[in-house]
């Protein structure tokens, strides 16, 4: 089928286009080109007769067209009016006609665009700015670039007028950027020069530097003021409200005490019309001041509060030093120094943090020390201690109990017997006690500052007869050659003798056995498996005697080196191999086997039926005691002969 291809389809003004003919039939008489979508003699561009090779211009011929023998048409120096359809009329030798239509579009070469703005100096947080891309061009696409990036998504950015206008609402100083617009059509793309948006802002609140406010007499005072502002701010200085000078820096050499006062920097922006001021109070000391310590909390609660101690005054070019208990600061994660060492922070104070604390100011000549100060750390009460520790008394004696709990401020004490309040004293005294005075004796300690209370309860038994004692232990399952065990005979009773028996015999003499606490406590050092015996304690006084039930010590030991039985190491092929492993251990160990290093089974006995020479090798028994955490093993070589 006869077709026409436009090369290119989109043509720039002034360039050329080739209407290329495809599938031209054979045996042609001639052909003719027309402007438009149909054959119209009034719009003929050119005709061509093949026999004579003669081209004849038509009414629509502009002089810019060239026809080729293959029927293709070249149009040069394209103008806007050339846009549209072109029809080729082919006349075959048999005078049968065939037509095909092609088309192309003509676009102008775009000029370099430029940006116009409705506000060259917008004020921050107040003005809007509308950028327009010039010129307005038909069939052009408009794009915008900010700092060579595509437009960010922002509710303050709005495109309108077919993207030709970019509006920035409520401009901020961050909108100060390079803006470019770009125009595009199918034949060209052009980008404008940058336009820098100059946003007027400020002045912000000025910053006076340096920050320190304390100076020594004779020093130079050099204050600098800065406020973010566009255009740059104009600065004025006032001392105690009196205007000094219109400069960004204020310099006063060789200052005296008279230069103490309030120093005000005023920043003014002539374009926005705004003023902002900052005031700093400068103190000039006649001589190096004696330092002193300020605190945010001198009555901290233990384990709750932090305390910040600050060394005053703040002086430039000064080294700050600290001492606690007349020593330099210890290394501790609870002690933190600020960057300038001026503030010492105690995190989560304890009762040991009372001090005293001193700070020092070091200059070229000397170190000036502050007076020492202390912290009143509020703590407690801890669990009260009731003394004496006896729990058994004979009738007729006096009962005198004293209670003490570590506390700041000192605890207030209350006594309760069987839950009934008795008195608000630290000591409880009952004369000439009887069996009726037996019961639960509670001491309650209260800290009024922290609001905390703690209690301790003691059972008091008044009896002529001694009770049957019992044995308490600090370690029910000691490990051999590692642990010690302390047996204590309960209860503690006044005027009582304590005795001990082991397996029904009196105590053997041994450096590993030690009696203490009035023979009430028996300690076995470095226990062995042979200490696994029955222990009995006895109490006696002038009236009665009694013995405890026996307590058997369960000593954990082993595993010892295991033994594999039978001891044979040579076997005949076809025999059964039945190896048993045993190791002394408490508790019983776990057993496992390996043959030639390969794990087998977790049993005490290894059985292999009808062994062959393939069963030759090393047989290892491994034992493990989970309670002692210890392991042991043994290896046996087995030879099987054919």
């Amino acid at each position: 089928k006869l077709t026409i291809e436009s090369t290119p389809f989109n043509v720039a003004e002034g360039k050329e286009v080739l209407l290329l003919v495809h599938n031209l039939p054979q045996h042609l008489f001639g052909y003719s080109w027309y402007k438009g979508e149909r054959v119209d003699g009034n719009r003929q561009i050119i005709g061509y007769v093949i026999g004579t090779q003669q081209a004849t211009p038509g009414p629509a011929y502009s002089g810019r067209e060239i026809i080729y023998p293959n029927a293709s048409l070249l149009i040069q120096n394209i103008i806007q009016n050339d846009t549209g359809f072109y029809t080729l009329h082919v006349i075959k030798s048999d005078l049968v006609n065939e037509e095909a239509t092609g088309q192309f579009r003509v676009y102008p070469e775009l000029p370099k665009p430029s940006i116009s703005s409705n506000n060259s100096k917008p004020v921050e947080d107040k003005d809007a700015v509308a950028f327009t891309c010039e010129p307005e061009t038909q069939d052009a696409t408009y794009l915008w670039w900010v700092n060579n990036q595509s437009l960010p998504v922002s509710p303050r950015l709005q495109l309108s007028n077919g993207n030709r206008t970019l509006t920035l609402f409520n401009v901020t100083r961050n909108d100060t950027a390079s803006y470019k617009c770009e125009t595009q059509n199918p034949v060209s793309a052009r980008r404008s020069d940058s336009v820098i948006l100059n946003v007027l802002y400020g002045p912000d609140a000025p910053t006076i530097s340096p920050l320190n406010t304390s100076y020594r007499s004779g020093e130079n005072l050099n204050l600098s003021c800065h406020a973010a502002s566009n255009p740059p701010a104009q600065y004025s200085w006032f001392v105690n409200g009196t205007f000094q000078q219109s400069t960004q820096e204020l310099f006063i050499p060789n200052i005296t005490v008279n230069n103490s006062g309030s120093y005000t920097c005023q920043a003014h922006n002539s374009d926005t019309g705004l003023n902002r001021t900052t005031v700093t109070t400068i103190t000039v000391y006649a001589e190096p001041p004696k330092p002193f310590i300020t605190s945010n909390n001198s009555n901290p609660v233990e384990d709750e509060d932090a305390v910040a101690l600050t060394c005053e005054p703040e002086i430039q070019n000064t080294t700050y030093l600290w001492w606690v208990n007349n020593q330099s600061l210890p290394v501790s994660p609870r002690l933190q120094l600020s960057n300038d060492n001026r503030t010492l922070t105690l995190l989560s104070v304890t009762r040991n943090d009372v001090g005293p604390y001193e700070c020092g100011i070091q200059n070229e000549l000397s170190v000036d020390h502050s007076d020492p100060v202390i912290l009143n750390v509020l703590y407690g009460p801890d669990d009260p201690t009731i003394s004496p520790s006896y729990t058994y008394y004979r009738p007729g004696v006096n009962l005198s109990l004293s209670c003490h709990a570590a506390s700041n401020p000192p605890a207030q004490y209350s006594w309760l017997i069987d839950g009934n309040i008795q008195q608000h004293t630290q000591e409880l005294f009952i004369s000439n006690i009887t069996e009726k005075n037996s019961g639960l004796y509670t001491c309650q300690a209260n800290n009024s500052a922290s609001g905390h209370s703690r209690t301790t309860v003691k059972t008091i038994t008044v009896s002529a007869e001694l009770p049957k004692p019992s044995i308490s232990s600090n370690n029910s399952k000691p490990v051999e050659d590692k642990d010690a065990v302390a047996f204590t005979c309960e209860p503690e009773a006044q005027n009582t003798t304590y005795l001990w028996w082991v397996n029904g015999q009196s105590l053997p003499v041994s450096p590993r056995l030690q009696l203490s606490n009035g023979n009430r406590t028996l300690t076995l050092f470095n226990v062995t498996r042979n200490d696994a015996r029955a222990y009995v304690c006895g109490i006696q006084n002038s009236v009665s005697a009694n013995r405890s039930d026996p307590v058997t010590l369960d000593v954990l030991y082993g595993p010892d080196t295991p033994i594999i039985s039978p001891p044979d190491s040579s076997y005949l092929s076809g025999a059964n191999l039945n190896l048993s492993c045993h190791s002394a251990s408490n508790p019983s160990p776990q057993y496992s086997w390996r043959i030639n290093g390969i794990p087998q089974q977790h049993t005490q006995v290894l059985f292999i039926a009808k062994i062959t020479p393939n069963n030759n090798g090393t047989y290892a028994c491994f034992v493990s005691n989970l309670a002692t955490g210890r392991n042991n093993s043994i290896v046996k070589s087995i030879t099987v002969s054919a």
Epitope: K290, S295, N296, S298, N376
Partner: nanobody
Framework: EVQLVESGGGVVQPGGSLRLSCAAS????????MGWFRQAPGAEREFVAA????????YYADSVKGRFTISRDNAKNTVYLQMNSLRPEDTALYYC?????????????????WGQGTLVTVSS
Amino acid sequence: EVQLVESGGGVVQPGGSLRLSCAASGLTFSTYTMGWFRQAPGAEREFVAAIIWSGSNTYYADSVKGRFTISRDNAKNTVYLQMNSLRPEDTALYYCAAQHFGPIGLTTRGYHYWGQGTLVTVSS
């Protein structure tokens, strides 16, 4: 028993002066850092001035610096607050506070013992 008793409060015109006294008893005065605090109606108690236990250092809130002076007389167990150039915003209940060998506490947590307060009213 420790007691701190403030006196010297009253009504004064703006620009006028007052001298507050705080008499301490039941404590070894020379070992106590003494402070003055004030509390205006509906406001929190705020630091005004303090003098360390040795008397060698004083410290003032920015709002009173240059107008108020704190001093102590260890022989009389008394601490003073001289208030000049008084302003209406100085109107408050003024409290005396003590801390044993304490640093100069800048918050109420810096003091152990407190007086009952004396009222200062600055009004025309």
